[in-house]
């Protein structure tokens, strides 16, 4: 803003070039091809103006009563095209007795501060100073539309000019454009388009896949009801006014479809009875995934070929398949669904569970005391383990010694070729409780039922063995 600081008003000639005709206070550059703006005055020339005046309350001794202060009439309405330049002014004659004056520009009730092109010029004479405040806008935009006024503060009074209405006309401007949508096949939907001038009216044509939908334009705003689509389409709208036409962005209307199958399924971890998988979802078919299905088939000529189905949420894209058999081969596929339906199953991938622990305990466990050697003999039969338990690597023997006030558990490991073991007597006059479990790479199986034997004090002999019966012999 180039407004001068408040000037002391001093006498001097008023330049002859200053004209009082209110229309001449509007200045517009005449460039090549330039159309002069239209101008309307809110009041007729010469008509007395009584609004927004300041009446001086104080007069110096012997002086005449000063006339009311008011801004001169100027152009009231300027219509011009976007990107043109415009300059408009307000003027006022102020008696020289007023030492400090400032003029400010306001638009739509807010003061225009900062880097606006406002210039105030002073033309002093003997008794009054003519002040012309001009405001210029280069390359006007729609945002420059509005009501502009000048304000002058003088002796704590505020003088306000008539408003100058700036109307920037241009191509239609969209306030609402159609939005991309994902719709169900053959289902009706609406698209909305709204554009404004000035100039008004703004008329709307709808375009589908480069062809106009409506032969007759509709006044903005316009709602297009599409009865339904069977395939993807691109819609846009054309907004027309006297200045020309603006085309909205083209929006794609997608038809919801079943998703594509996942594009990657990975095995992350396998245990004896579970497999952790992840997948990368395929294209969602323009409809969010709802859930996924993990399908599992056992790859075994002897299996009945049935498929286990595990339903899970669509996210995270990971699932731990449980309740599987140990040391088994599985074929795994993943399918996901959206509101339309299920995707095809991904290509089947292969995965194997690891060895499991044995599911049965050793059989016919017998325990007897060999007093001469001061040890306990333990014998058993190899359990009938399933193939899934994997290869037997040995046995774990638990023996617990209990006597008055003490209890002590010891564990022994023996190799898979053994079916007997000897353990040293730990405590006399005590009960020894023996249990045996089979061991594979998959882990330790269940322990056999406990077999108890009493270890007497030294010198007392009983060779009678203790045993667990074999299954079916009880």
């Amino acid at each position: 803003r180039e407004e001068a600081k408040p000037y002391p008003l001093f006498p001097g000639p008023l330049p002859g070039s200053l004209q009082t005709d209110h229309t001449s206070l509007l200045s517009l550059p005449h460039t090549s091809g330039y159309q002069p703006a239209l101008m309307f005055s809110p009041t007729q020339p010469g008509r007395p103006y009584t609004g927004n005046v300041a009446i001086p309350r104080v007069t110096s001794a012997g002086s005449k009563l000063l006339p009311p202060l008011a801004f001169k009439h100027t152009v009231g309405h300027i219509i011009l095209s976007e990107h043109k330049d415009v300059k408009f002014n307000c003027s006022i004659s102020v008696p020289n007795i007023y030492q400090d004056t400032t003029i400010s520009w306001w638009k739509d009730g807010k003061e225009l501060l900062g880097a606006h092109h406002a210039i105030t010029q002073f033309y002093p004479d003997d008794e009054v100073t003519a002040i012309i405040a001009s405001f210029s806008i280069t390359s006007v935009q729609r945002s420059d539309n509005g009501s502009y006024i000048c304000k002058m503060k003088i002796n704590n009074e505020e003088i306000v000019s008539d408003p100058i209405y700036i109307e920037v006309q241009g191509l239609p401007h969209f306030t609402k454009q159609p939005e991309s949508m994902n719709v169900t096949r053959n289902t009706a939907f609406n698209l909305t388009c709204q554009a404004v001038g000035p100039p008004e009216p703004v008329n709307i044509f709808w375009v589908q896949n480069s062809s106009r939908v409506n032969e007759q334009p509709e006044k903005s705003p316009s709602v297009l009801t599409v009865p339904g689509l069977t395939e993807m389409a691109v819609f846009s709208c054309e907004a027309h006014n006297d200045k020309g036409l603006t085309v909205s962005k083209g929006v794609q209307i997608n038809i919801k479809a079943i998703p594509s199958p996942p594009t990657e399924v990975s095995i992350h971890n396998s245990t004896a009875h579970s497999i952790l998988i992840s997948w990368v979802p395929g294209f969602d078919g323009y409809s969010p995934f709802r859930n996924c299905s993990v399908q599992v088939k056992e790859v075994d000529p002897l299996s009945n070929g049935s498929v286990m189905i595990f339903n899970t949420s669509a996210s995270p894209h990971m699932y731990q398949i449980k309740q599987l058999q140990a040391l088994a081969n599985y074929s795994i596929g993943v399918s996901c669904m959206n509101e339309i339906g299920w995707s095809a199953v991904s290509p089947w991938i292969l995965a194997s569970t690891t060895e499991g622990a044995p599911s049965v305990a050793p059989l016919n466990v017998t325990v007897f005391l060999n007093e001469s050697r001061d040890n306990v003999d333990i014998r058993w039969m190899k359990p009938l383990t399933k193939r899934q338990a994997g290869e037997l690597v040995g046995y774990r023997i638990s023996h617990v010694w209990q006597s008055a006030g003490i209890s002590k558990e010891l564990l022994e490991e023996v190799g898979q070729n053994n079916s007997r073991a000897q353990i040293s007597v730990q405590v006399h006059n005590a009960t020894c409780t023996v249990r045996i479990a089979a061991v594979t790479k998959g882990g330790v199986g269940p322990f056999s039922d406990p077999v108890k034997i009493f270890i007497p004090a030294h010198g007392w002999v009983d060779h009678a063995p203790s045993s667990t019966p074999a299954p079916g012999n009880a």
Epitope: T263, E264, S266
Partner: antibody, heavy 119, light 112 residues
Framework: QSVEESGGRLVTPGTPLTLTCTVS????????MSWVRQAPGKGLEWLGI?????DPVYATWARGRFTISRTSTTVNLKITSPTTEDTATYFC????????????????WGQGTLVTVSS | AQVLTQTASSVSAAVGGTVTISCQSS????????LSWYQQKPGQPPKLLIY???KLASGVPSRFSGSGSGTQFTLTISDVQCDEAATYYC????????????FGGGTEVVVT
């Protein structure tokens, strides 16, 4: 949907070269990608795969000679120390489905970019 | 190492005739069926024809068919057309840690 390779040019032996693959119409966050090459007048050779969920997997002969990497928008193939035997057209290819680095099928091929290694 | 062998490097066929191309895998391909076939014309990239041994890729004429499982696979083109003169490659996925994919050496089809 399309795949496009770039970066192929004449290089001298031993000068590292990086080829870039850009895609459109689909997302690299969804698909594994492979590189395949073809020497003039010869057959197709698979170099490796960069998956979404696991580390890159290379053909045995290609390990150490090539590095495959990916960003959110590109897949890159670095020829670490080219020899004259690496003169070929290099194709970037979308993998329709994969598991643990095993491609199921290669369904979308780029036009290829020619690399010439000569002193 | 994974090897796919296409025994015939070139085969001829008359227009309207039938062509059979074989592909042998060692070892067996992943899941017994992860084998695909590709067509390559001079100056062009390969194009997917068949996957999972027998499934037709999108947009491929039904005159192309595939069969086989495990280690032996066949591509058949019936009612051969002139523009199907090309080199055909088999390719397979394998379950080892590396070399998880390999191409056969290719078979050129000459249409007379």
């Amino acid at each position: 949907q399309s795949v496009e390779e770039s970066g192929g040019r004449l290089v001298t032996p031993g000068t590292p070269l990086t080829l870039t693959c850009t895609v459109s119409g689909f997302s690299l966050s969804t698909y594994s990608m492979s590189w395949v090459r073809q020497a003039p007048g010869k057959g197709l050779e698979w170099l490796g795969i960069v998956s979404v969920a696991i580390d890159p997997v290379y053909a045995t002969w290609a390990r150490g000679r090539f590095t495959i990497s990916r960003t959110s928008t590109t897949v890159n193939l670095k020829i670490t120390s080219p020899t004259t035997e690496d003169t070929a057209t290099y194709f970037c290819v979308r993998v329709a489905f994969s598991t643990n680095g095993i491609p199921h099928r290669l369904d979308l091929w780029g036009q290829g970019t020619l690399v010439t290694v000569s002193s | 190492a994974q090897v796919l062998t296409q025994t015939a490097s070139s085969v001829s066929a008359a227009v309207g005739g039938t062509v059979t191309i074989s592909c042998q895998s060692s070892p067996s391909v992943y899941n017994h069926n992860w084998l695909s076939w590709y067509q390559q014309k001079p100056g062009q990239p390969p194009k997917l024809l068949i996957y999972e041994a027998s499934k037709l890729a999108s947009g491929v004429p039904s005159r192309f068919s595939g069969s086989g499982s495990g280690t032996q696979f066949t591509l058949t083109i019936s009612d051969v057309q002139c523009d199907e003169a090309a080199t055909y490659y088999c390719a397979g996925g394998f379950s080892s840690g590396s070399d998880s994919f390999a191409f056969g050496g290719g078979t050129e089809v000459v249409v007379t």
